[in-house]
């Protein structure tokens, strides 16, 4: 799978994580920080 950094318009897309662009799947993906979940790493869990 080809990946790259997200475009600058997606700054802030991932609330608590890193945004990566999955080129072949035509979509952005949030790699969440520890303790966060959700499509955009918007949920905190203990």
């Amino acid at each position: 799978v080809s990946i790259t950094k997200c475009n600058s318009d997606m700054n802030g897309y991932c609330l608590h994580g890193q945004c990566i662009y999955l080129v072949d799947m035509s979509q952005n993906y949030c790699r969440c920080e520890v303790g966060y979940t959700g499509v955009r790493c918007e949920h905190f869990y203990l």
Partner: antibody, heavy 116, light 106 residues
Framework: QDQLVQSGAEVKKPGASVKVSCKAS????????IQWVRQAPGQGLEWMGR????????KYREKFEGRVTITADTSTNTAYMELSSLRSEDTAVYYC?????????WGQGTLVTVSS | DIQMTQSPSSLSASVGDRVTITCKAS??????IAWYQQKPGQAPRLLIQ???TLQPGVPSRFSGSGSGTDYTFTISSLQPEDIATYYC????????FGGGTKVEIK
């Protein structure tokens, strides 16, 4: 199946406002950005602006600043585009477009006609 | 706002010809360019994103290339069903469409 279903065609008088809706099904708009694009008859595609429904943040093309308002209601999974002070040049098909979780998934378009 | 200059605005070619359309951005868009095909009365159809990644179901005669500010879209062998208007879109920093290229058969 993911869908963006837009409201029906509108006819408006110059100076009026129009509000076009874009209801999402099959996915949560909070996971995406919703863009709005328009196309006047026989003309090219023009990006108008977008909203991040999770945060409520909006970005608009400079030429529409102050005349367009993009909103989202996450409880109904619906985005809206309101354009005010309509003039004949605003006659166009208006599209909502999902981006973020999937690259550019388009609604069916809404024709807005501005005529006296 | 980033400007996208697309050329030519129209072209006429024969079936089987190689067709090339270019888009020039006013600043580096880091390969974040997409190409759309639009036929009369239809919504635009995404053909290519991230400069050269073909969407599922799109014929291999369509291709894209480029980097920095200069990008190219190519139809290697024009077919009658390719008659349409083609648009580039930069999506690095907000969004800007090129002016479109109307492709006709000679």
């Amino acid at each position: 199946q993911d869908q963006l279903v837009q409201s029906g065609a509108e006819v408006k008088k110059p100076g009026a406002s129009v509000k076009v809706s874009c209801k999402a099904s099959g996915f949560n708009i909070k996971d995406t950005y919703i863009q709005w694009v328009r196309q006047a008859p026989g003309q090219g595609l023009e990006w108008m602006g977008r909203i991040d429904p999770l945060r409520g943040n909006t970005k608009y093309r400079e030429k529409f600043e102050g005349r367009v308002t993009i909103t989202a209601d996450t409880s109904t999974n619906t985005a809206y585009m309101e354009l005010s002070s309509l003039r004949s040049e605003d006659t166009a098909v208006y599209y909502c477009v999902r981006s973020g979780t999937l690259f550019d998934f388009w609604g069916q378009g809404t024709l807005v006609t501005v005529s006296s | 706002d980033i400007q996208m200059t697309q050329s030519p605005s129209s072209l006429s070619a024969s079936v089987g010809d190689r067709v090339t359309i270019t888009c020039k951005a006013s600043q580096d868009i880091h390969k974040y360019i997409a190409w759309y095909q639009q036929k009369p009365g239809q919504a635009p159809r995404l053909l290519i994103q991230y400069t050269s990644t073909l969407q599922p179901g799109v014929p291999s005669r369509f291709s894209g290339s480029g980097s920095g500010t200069d990008y190219t879209f190519t139809i290697s062998s024009l077919q009658p069903e390719d008659i349409a208007t083609y648009y580039c879109l930069q999506y690095d920093n907000l969004r800007t469409f090129g002016g479109g290229t109307k492709v006709e058969i000679k």
